[in-house]
C-alpha cells in the first residue's frame, strides 16, 4: 500500500493488499476498499467500464468476464487499483474483436488472458500462415498484444492470439487487421477543363477529379474571392485498397455573364492541400474578332507570290468562311484550319495563297467569317508592283515632245539629250509639263503619268531618251532629230527597256 | 456494455441544419470508429459517413458529401453529425453506431428522429 | 459505390419454419458481410458479421454463409420474435452500403 506524509489525503487501500489477483472460475470476488472520503468502485477491461458505489466489491460467482483491472477511488481523486484474473480453462482470452491500426503507428489487438500463467503468449496467422517477417509484436496479459509501427501492407490480415496451455496451442477467434492509411502526398486534384466559354443561359458543368489513398480526403469547388457555397454532386469508386478516386461535379444549369470568373477545386488530407483552377467566361452573345497576320495593305511585286493571312477567334464555332475578289468567291487556293485541337480552342486560320500575281490581279481581297451570332469580315488592299511601261511617245503639232508611261508605283519620267552620235545621255532636260492621269482601270491598277518636253530648245543632231522609272525597274523611249538646213526631222523614235 | 445515447427528437424548417449528438457510457470511445446510419419512414438504411474520434478525420457517404460534417470530442466521448441544407427527404431517424470502417456495427444508439417540414 | 440486392423483398411464413434470404453484391466483396435484424421503432441488432460469424449473444438458429458476391442468412426454424426485417451491408471498403431489406411477416 502506498505511503504518505501525516496531513495529506492518501489513496484508499484496497484489501486484499496486492497489485494482481487470481482466482478460479465460479469462485467468489471480494474486494474492499478503505477510505474515510470513499467514493466509488470502477471496473475496467477491453474499452468498457462499469461502477460500482459500495465499498465492497462481491462477484459471488466469478465468470471469465469478470478479468479485469478494479480501481477505488475517493474524494480527493486519488486511487489505488487491483488487477483480478479469473482462470477460465475454456475461456483463456477476452476479446473484442475490433481491430483497428493506422499506418506508421502501434495498435493493440485486444485479447487480455484470464490466466496470466500461460505460456508463450503471441500472434498467430490465420489457417496457418506465417505472418508477415518484419511485423512485430508485444504482448500484455492484461491489455492484448501491441503490434508496433503497423504497415499498409498488414491491412486485411487475419490474425489470432495464441498461448500454449498444458503443451497444446490455443488459438483466440480470428482479428482481422483493417489498416488505415497514412497521408503522405497531397491529393492529386485535376479538372475536366482548364477554361470554358458560354454564351448567355447555358449550362456550365465542370468535373474536379481527387485522388487519394482514403475516402476521408476533404475536397470542395471554391469561387475565388467568394463565400458562397456552391452546388456539387460527388461520385466515388475504391479501385482498390488506398486507391480511392472522387469526381465532383460543379453545375450552373443557367449561366450568367456575372458567373464569369475563376472556380477552384479545392483537396486537403492531413498531409497537405492541393488545389486546380478553371475559368469561366460567358458572353451575352457570340464573338468573331479577326486579327490580321501581316499588314492589311500589300505591295508584291508583279509575277511574285503572297500569302494573305488572317487569326480569328470565333464563338460559337465558325460555320461559313470564304474569300472574296472582284465580287467573286474563291473555290480554291484558300485553306482554314483551328489553332489548336484543344477542344476549348476559339481561334482559328484562314489563309489565301495568291500565286505569280499580275499587275491586273491587284485590288480588295476580303475574308468574310460567320457563326450562329454574328458576322465578321477584313480586307487586304493588294498593290501590285509592276515596271514602267510607256505607253505612247510622241512629237506633237505643237513641236512638244511627249512621254507617256504606265506602272506601280507611280513612274518618275526624266529627259536627257544626246548631241550627235554619243550613246550616253547625260544631260538632263527640265519637262515642261508633267501630269498623273486618271486610269480607266481599276483603283489598284497602274498609275499613268504624261511628261513634255519643248523640242524647240534642241540645236543640233541628236537623240532625245525619255526614261520612265520606279522601285521596280525603268523602261526608255528615244527621238532621234537631224537637222537639213534650218529644218528639223524627227527620225523614227525607239524604245530601250532597261529592266 | 458499451451504449450510444443519443439527443432527442429535431423538428426543423427547409434549408436549416440540425446537430445530432451521440454520447458513449459504460466504455471508451477512441479505439472505435462511429458510423451514422439513417433510415426514412419505412425505407432501407443508409450509411452516411464514419469518423474516428482519435483522429477526427472524417469519411463520407458520396450523397451526403458537402452536406454532412462528422466531429468528435473525445474528452466528452460525444460524436456529432450536422446536416446542413435540411429538405423533407430528409426526414428521419439518425443513428449512431460502433464501427463503420471496413466493419460491421456492433452497437447502436437508440435511434433520433429528425422531421423537416415548413 | 458497391450495389447490394437483397431478395425477397418480403415473404411470409410461419413459426418453426426454415427460411433463407439471400443477398447479391455488385462486385466481390469477399466475407465482408454483416446481417442485421430490426424491429418497428427499435434500432438494427448484428445477427452475423464476416458472413458467417455468429455475433455474441445471438441465437444459433441463426447462420450466414457465402463469399465474394452471394451470401445466405438462414433461420433453421422461425420463432415468434423473428418476425422483422433482416439488412445485408458490405464493408469490403470505407464506403459501406445495405441491402433494402426483407420484411419477414407471419403467416
Known amino acids: 500500500q502506498p505511503s504518505v506524509s501525516p496531513g495529506e489525503p492518501s489513496p484508499p487501500s484496497i484489501h486484499p493488499g496486492k497489485s494482481d489477483l487470481i482466482v478460479r472460475v465460479g469462485d467468489e470476488i471480494r474486494l474492499l476498499c478503505t477510505d474515510p472520503g470513499f467514493v466509488k468502485w470502477t471496473f475496467e477491461i477491453l474499452d468498457e467500464t462499469n461502477e460500482n458505489k459500495q465499498n465492497e466489491w462481491i462477484t459471488e460467482k466469478a465468470e471469465a468476464t469478470n478479468t479485469g483491472k478494479y480501481t477505488c477511488t475517493n474524494k480527493h481523486g486519488l486511487s489505488n487499483s487491483i488487477y483480478v484474473f479469473v482462470r477460465d480453462p475454456a475461456k483463456l482470452f477476452l476479446v473484442d474483436r475490433s481491430l483497428y491500426g493506422k499506418e506508421d503507428n502501434d495498435t493493440l489487438v485486444r485479447c487480455p488472458l484470464t490466466d496470466p500463467e500461460v505460456t508463450n503468449y503471441s500472434l498467430k496467422g490465420c489457417q496457418g500462415k506465417p505472418l508477415p517477417k518484419d511485423l512485430r509484436f508485444i504482448p500484455d496479459p492484461k491489455a492484448g498484444i501491441m503490434i508496433k509501427s503497423v504497415k499498409r501492407a498488414y491491412h486485411r490480415l487475419c490474425l489470432h492470439c495464441s498461448v500454449d496451455q498444458e503443451g497444446k496451442s490455443v488459438l483466440s477467434e480470428k482479428f482481422i487487421l483493417k489498416v488505415r492509411p497514412a497521408f503522405k502526398a497531397v491529393p492529386v486534384v485535376s479538372v475536366s477543363k482548364a477554361s470554358y466559354l458560354l454564351r448567355e443561359g447555358e449550362e456550365f458543368t465542370v468535373t474536379c477529379t481527387i485522388k487519394d489513398v482514403s475516402s476521408s480526403v476533404y475536397s470542395t469547388w471554391k469561387r475565388e474571392n467568394s463565400q458562397t457555397k456552391l452546388q456539387e454532386k460527388y461520385n466515388s469508386w475504391h479501385h482498390g485498397d488506398f486507391n480511392y478516386e472522387r469526381q465532383a461535379t460543379l453545375t450552373i444549369s443557367s449561366a450568367r455573364v456575372n458567373d464569369s470568373g475563376v472556380f477552384m477545386c479545392y483537396a486537403n488530407n492531413t498531409f497537405g492541400s492541393a488545389n486546380v483552377t478553371t475559368t469561366l467566361e460567358v458572353v451575352d452573345k457570340g464573338f468573331i474578332n479577326i486579327f490580321p497576320m501581316i499588314n492589311t495593305t500589300v505591295f508584291v511585286n508583279d509575277g511574285e507570290n503572297v500569302d494573305l493571312i488572317v487569326e480569328y477567334e470565333a464563338f460559337p464555332k465558325p460555320e461559313h468562311q470564304q474569300w472574296i475578289y472582284m465580287n467573286r468567291t474563291f473555290t480554291d487556293k484558300w485553306e482554314d484550319y483551328p489553332k489548336s485541337e484543344n477542344e476549348s480552342n476559339i481561334r482559328y486560320v484562314s489563309e489565301l495563297h495568291l500565286t505569280r500575281l499580275k499587275g491586273t490581279e491587284g485590288g480588295t481581297y476580303t475574308f468574310l467569317v460567320s457563326n450562329s451570332d454574328v458576322n465578321a469580315a477584313i480586307a487586304f488592299n493588294v498593290y501590285v508592283n509592276t515596271k514602267p511601261e510607256i505607253l505612247t511617245y510622241d512629237r506633237l503639232v505643237n513641236g512638244m515632245l511627249q512621254c507617256v508611261a504606265a506602272g506601280f508605283p507611280e513612274p518618275t519620267i526624266d529627259w536627257y539629250f544626246c548631241p550627235g552620235t554619243e550613246q550616253r545621255c547625260s544631260a538632263s532636260v527640265l519637262p515642261v509639263d508633267v501630269q498623273t492621269l486618271n486610269s480607266s482601270g481599276p483603283p489598284f491598277g497602274k498609275l499613268v503619268v504624261q511628261s513634255s518636253i519643248d523640242s524647240s530648245a534642241f540645236k543640233h543632231n541628236g537623240t532625245v531618251e525619255c526614261k520612265a522609272y520606279n522601285d521596280v525597274g525603268k523602261t526608255s523611249a528615244y527621238f532621234n532629230f537631224a537637222f537639213k538646213g534650218n529644218n528639223k526631222e524627227q527620225i523614227h523614235p525607239h524604245t530601250l527597256f532597261t529592266p | 456494455q458499451v451504449q450510444l445515447v443519443q439527443s432527442g427528437a429535431e423538428v426543423k424548417k427547409p434549408g436549416s441544419s440540425v446537430k445530432v449528438s451521440c454520447k458513449a457510457s459504460?466504455?471508451?470511445?477512441?479505439?472505435?470508429?462511429i458510423s451514422w446510419v439513417r433510415q426514412a419512414p419505412g425505407q432501407g438504411l443508409e450509411w452516411m459517413g464514419v469518423?474516428?474520434?482519435?483522429?477526427?478525420?472524417?469519411g463520407y457517404a458520396q450523397k451526403f458529401q458537402g452536406r454532412v460534417t462528422i466531429t468528435a470530442d473525445e474528452s466528452t466521448s460525444t460524436a456529432y453529425m450536422e446536416l446542413s441544407s435540411l429538405r423533407s427527404e430528409d426526414t428521419a431517424v439518425y443513428y449512431c453506431?460502433?464501427?463503420?470502417?471496413?466493419?460491421?456495427?456492433?452497437?447502436w444508439g437508440q435511434g433520433t428522429l429528425v422531421t423537416v417540414s415548413s | 459505390d458497391i450495389q447490394m440486392t437483397q431478395s425477397p423483398s418480403s415473404l411470409s411464413a410461419s413459426v418453426g419454419d426454415r427460411v433463407t434470404i439471400t443477398c447479391r453484391a455488385s462486385?466481390?466483396?469477399?466475407?465482408?458481410l454483416a446481417w442485421y435484424q430490426q424491429k418497428p421503432g427499435k434500432a438494427p441488432k448484428l445477427l452475423i458479421y464476416?458472413?458467417?460469424s455468429l455475433q455474441s449473444g445471438v441465437p444459433s438458429r441463426f447462420s450466414g454463409s457465402g463469399s465474394g458476391t452471394d451470401f445466405t442468412l438462414t433461420i433453421s426454424s422461425l420463432q415468434p420474435e423473428d418476425f422483422a426485417t433482416y439488412y445485408c451491408?458490405?464493408?469490403?471498403?470505407?464506403?459501406?452500403?445495405f441491402g433494402q431489406g426483407t420484411k419477414v411477416e407471419i403467416k
Open positions: 469518423i474516428f474520434p482519435a483522429e477526427g478525420a472524417p
Open positions: 453506431a460502433r464501427g463503420g470502417y471496413i466493419s460491421d456495427f456492433d452497437v
Open positions: 462486385q466481390s466483396i469477399s466475407n465482408y
Open positions: 459504460g466504455g471508451t470511445f477512441s479505439s472505435y470508429a
Open positions: 464476416d458472413a458467417s
Open positions: 451491408q458490405q464493408y469490403y471498403y470505407e464506403s459501406i452500403t
